[in-house]
Interface confidence: medium
């Protein structure tokens, strides 16, 4: 429980965490470990998750063994019309976890944003919303006649019309990859994805790149020039690294991010490159993450709802991706 | 870009009332807190309470109970700091603010003068 | 009502590191923003959440907060840094302000 012996980390790799725990440096500095969440035990070789404005409180002196993780005290949050405190998680729907922490809230999705491509036993999939049930469901949807089946893959391939490209086709395995997903962040550092089965095993994968659309402190209204109706490649002034889990990015970067609309429509990224990007944390572990980059942007009016902001931004798409 | 605009410099004679107010502008004014914080001549930064413009609760700091009303109006953006029964000794500049997160932001202050 | 005590001032020479303490109970426990203020304006937040920095404040600015005492350090001080400094946090739903501290650059 205690710092006081050897670094001793299990032989595997650091642990998979569930969708919005930290993985974290123990305290002890020895091991990658799962951050505890709040109202979990910890210890000082189980630290609570720093991300989220945790600290284990330990209560009287005399335990200083095992604590509860327990939230600072922040800024309030307030949230369709109620009132959260800092380090309060809430349910605003049935499909989002959130938690305020001093003054913003951020949510996690809870059903799953998982893409299905269409296949021989399943060539109509799409989400339905059944009867009961919070988070939509993929149906497989039989076509009329049993005989159409054949035709719509071959149609699926774009074979009928174009023909197959031939780098697409490698040892039996047809390679299809989706769109980018939207950036999960209007502005600030997010998170986008894909499925694809361009691998050698030809198995479905989800991929994840960063992304930023913009800056959330840029005031970027100020530079749309007089008639034009998105600021299509603005720059930030000057060059600037790039800030995750407070790691910072080794090099820096002239980016290219998307302003704002004049005529009430989302200006999001429509060109985009993926590169990867190399971070520094202060513990000097260095990670490679791939990255977004915004070449064009486009204006559209499939903007976040007022009703479910986090459903459109995780449902619209990102186009004419280089990488 | 986020703006808190607020009413000019008043003058008061002890036992008066003074009504600031604080337009805000460039967010969704219903979203965050707007926090009222005095500083007179000289001295430091006194936080005098907050009001949630979405449901118009506030929450006042001890010193200030029974002489303070803060108010919105949602429909200009606007939030309002009452200060009753004034005395000399608050002779300040008052500051509407919204505090939390990584994004505060300080009205330019209101100089509100009490004297005889 | 809580109380957060600062030192009335703190005297730097030029290129040197100013550290300002900030006190109180349990403080490492709640969130500690810091403040500077120059006469005749608004306060401006150079950190928040015990040690991170709004775009725009160098980076010789830095926080840290625990047990019961938070310090801003200004590493590298210059003369445009001489200005007041307050620390602030939240005790439940209420904020707090330190009294103060003058930061003088000889």
């Known amino acids: 429980q205690n710092c006081s012996g050897p670094c001793r980390c299990p032989d595997e790799p650091a642990p998979r965490c569930p969708a919005g725990v930290s993985l974290v440096l123990d305290g002890c500095g020895c091991c990658r470990v799962c951050a505890k969440q709040l109202g979990e035990l910890c210890t000082e070789r189980d630290p609570c998750d720093p991300h989220k404005g945790l600290f284990c409180h330990f209560g009287s002196p005399a335990n200083r063994k095992i604590g509860v993780c327990t939230a600072k005290d922040g800024a309030p949050c307030i949230f369709g019309g109620t009132v959260y405190r800092s380090g309060e998680s809430f349910q605003s729907s049935c499909k989002y976890q959130c938690t305020c922490l001093d003054g913003a809230v951020g949510c996690m999705p809870l059903c799953s944003m998982d893409v299905r491509l269409p296949s021989p036993d399943c060539p109509f999939p799409r989400r339905v919303k059944l009867p009961g049930k919070c988070c939509e469901e993929w149906v497989c949807d039989e076509p009329k006649d049993q005989t159409v089946v054949g035709p719509a893959l071959a149609a699926y391939r774009l074979e009928d019309t174009f023909g197959p490209d031939p780098t697409m086709i490698r040892a039996n395995c047809l390679v299809q990859t989706t769109e980018w997903s939207a950036c999960s962040k209007t502005c600030g550092m997010g998170i986008s994805t894909r499925v694809t089965n361009d691998n050698a095993s030809c198995r479905l994968e989800k991929q994840s790149r960063l992304c930023m659309v913009r800056p959330c402190e840029a005031d970027l209204e100020e530079n749309i020039k007089k008639g034009k109706k998105c600021i299509r490649t603005p720059k930030i002034s000057k060059p600037i690294k790039f800030e995750l889990s407070g790691c910072t990015s080794m090099k820096t970067y002239r980016a290219k991010f998307c302003g704002v609309c004049t005529d009430g429509r989302c200006c999001t990224p429509h060109r985009t490159t993926t590169l990867p990007v190399e971070f520094k944390c202060p513990d000097g572990e260095v990670m490679k993450k791939n990255m977004m980059f915004i070449k064009t942007c486009a204006c559209h009016y499939n903007c976040p709802g007022d009703n479910d902001i986090f459903e459109s931004l995780y449902y619209r798409k990102m186009y004419g991706d280089m990488a | 870009e986020v703006q808190l605009v607020q009413s000019g410099a008043e003058v008061k004679k002890p036992g008066a009332s003074v009504k600031v107010s604080c337009k805000a502008s460039g967010y969704t004014f219903t979203g965050y807190y707007m926090h009222w914080v005095r500083q007179a001549p000289g001295q430091g930064l006194e936080w005098m309470g907050w009001?949630?413009?979405?449901?118009?609760?506030?929450n006042y700091a001890q010193k200030f109970q029974g002489r303070v009303t803060m108010t919105r109006d949602t429909s200009i953006s606007t939030a309002y700091m009452e200060l009753s029964r004034l005395r000399s000794d608050d002779t300040a500049i008052y500051y509407c603010a919204r505090v939390g997160g990584s994004a505060h932001y300080w009205g330019q202050g209101t100089l509100v003068t009490v004297s005889s | 009502q809580p109380v957060l005590t600062q030192p009335p001032s703190v005297s730097v020479s030029p290129g040197q590191t100013a550290s300002i303490t900030c006190s109180g109970d349990?403080?490492?426990?709640?969130?500690a923003s810091w403040y500077q203020q120059k006469p005749g304006q608004s306060p401006v937040l150079v950190i928040y959440?015990?040690?991170k920095r709004p775009s725009g404040i160098p980076e010789r600015f830095s926080g840290s907060n625990s047990g019961n005492t938070a310090t801003l350090t200004i590493s590298g001080t210059q003369a445009m840094d001489e200005a007041d400094y307050y620390c602030q946090a939240w005790d439940s739903s209420h904020v707090v302000f330190g009294g103060g501290t003058k930061v003088t650059v000889l």
């Open positions: 009001i949630n413009p979405n449901s118009g609760g506030t």
């Open positions: 349990k403080l490492g426990h709640k969130y």
């Open positions: 959440q015990d040690r």
